[in-house]
């Protein structure tokens, strides 16, 4: 069964900067990745970025840079311009559309006890959907 993993990392040097890493574990080719926060895409979540392997990358503030890391994983850098970061208690969700498997989504957040610079371990898959 395909799986999606999510890691949320606070940058050690900038406490207002976070990076979300997401990956797809499974066969098939990825046709689209959607990253959202506050919940799954289309279910109360707000889009942060859309990464298409051919068309490029579209991102919404406070996303700063979305990039493919490998053929099946992406990273999204976020920067909070406010005094205190809202990211620490936020859920981030990644949805991978792949052919021929369909869509798979998982969510994760920064553990409350995380030290800056340390990433959360790969999140168990609390929301795993095949559309």
């Amino acid at each position: 069964t395909p799986e999606v993993w999510v890691q949320v990392q606070m940058e050690a040097t900038e406490l207002s900067s976070f990076t979300v890493h997401c990956g797809f574990l499974g066969p098939g080719s990825i046709s689209l990745v959607t990253v959202s926060w506050g919940g799954p895409d289309g279910a109360g979540g707000t889009k942060l970025a859309v990464l298409h392997p051919e068309l490029g990358t579209r991102q919404w503030a406070p996303a700063r840079q979305a990039r493919w890391e490998t053929q099946s994983s992406i990273s999204l850098a976020l920067e909070d311009s406010g005094a205190s970061s809202p990211f620490a208690n936020t859920t981030f969700c990644c949805k991978f559309a792949s052919f021929p498997e369909g869509s798979w989504e998982s969510c994760g957040s920064l553990p409350p006890s995380s030290d800056p610079g340390l990433s959360a371990p790969p999140t168990p898959v609390p929301i795993l959907r095949a559309d």
């Epitope: 889009k47 298409h52 392997p53 051919e54 068309l55 490029g56 579209r58 919404w60 840079q65 493919w68």
Partner: antibody, heavy 120, light 113 residues
């Protein structure tokens, strides 16, 4: 053929708002995001934002986020860009442009431009 | 935001000669997934909107004469006009179409010597 026809020139006072329209024809209107780009006199090009005509989803440049509103009227295949709290630095030609089918941010068809002059 | 820097600011070339315009980006525009560089070139004549010439660094837009060619990868790109024609007098802009917000170079004014 693809055509983007914009509304006419505007003269506005500082602090006022302006709403520019862009009517599209010659292609499947809901299938392409529409972008707005401006060019101050003798200057370069600056991206303002984009709107998805199929659902009204917008994406704005941070520099304009608090002052710009983009809307769409699918019944007339028209998109609108409203810029508020105008200042003299907003004097520019404003263009609507359609994204290229092969990539999100290359712009393959442009309107003729709308000159917005902000002057007291 | 990705910063685009063009050079030179202006260029005078004789008719029939080669014109070369350079563009540098503050970060790589190479998409590791499809190995394409997300860099576009536009031509703008006085009183007209910009016209897309090249995208993905080297793909010519349909209808664009083959004397226009784009090259480069990563952060360094070039637009070449192999044999300058009178109608090529214009301002040329590069633009990254890699990610939001798309950003443009400052422009290069091309004139006839």
């Amino acid at each position: 053929q693809v055509q983007l026809v914009q509304s006419g020139a505007e003269v506005k006072k500082p602090g006022a708002s302006v709403k520019v329209s862009c009517k599209a024809s010659g292609y499947s209107f809901p299938s392409y995001w529409m972008h707005w780009v401006r060019q101050a006199p003798g200057q370069g090009l600056e991206w303002i934002g984009e709107i998805n005509p199929s659902n009204g989803l917008t994406n704005y440049n941070e520099q304009f986020r608090n002052r710009v509103t983009m809307t769409v009227d699918t019944s007339t295949s028209t998109v609108y860009m409203e810029l508020s709290s105008l200042r003299s630095e907003d004097t520019a030609v404003y263009y609507c442009a359609r994204h290229h089918g092969s990539t999100y941010y290359a712009l393959d068809s442009w309107g003729q431009g709308t000159l917005v002059t902000v002057s007291s | 935001d990705i910063v685009m820097t063009q050079s030179p600011d202006s260029l005078a070339v004789s008719l029939g000669e080669r014109a070369t315009i350079n563009c540098k980006s503050s970060q790589s525009l190479l998409n590791s997934i499809n190995q394409k560089n997300f860099l576009a070139w536009y031509q703008q004549k006085p009183g007209q909107p910009p016209k897309l010439l090249v995208y993905f660094a080297s793909t010519r837009e349909s209808g664009v004469p083959d004397r226009f060619s784009g090259s480069g990868s990563g952060t360094d790109f070039t637009l070449t006009i192999s044999s300058l024609q009178a109608e090529d007098v214009a301002v040329y802009f590069c633009q990254q179409h890699y990610s939001t917000p798309p950003t443009f170079g400052g422009g290069t004014k091309l004139e006839i010597k």
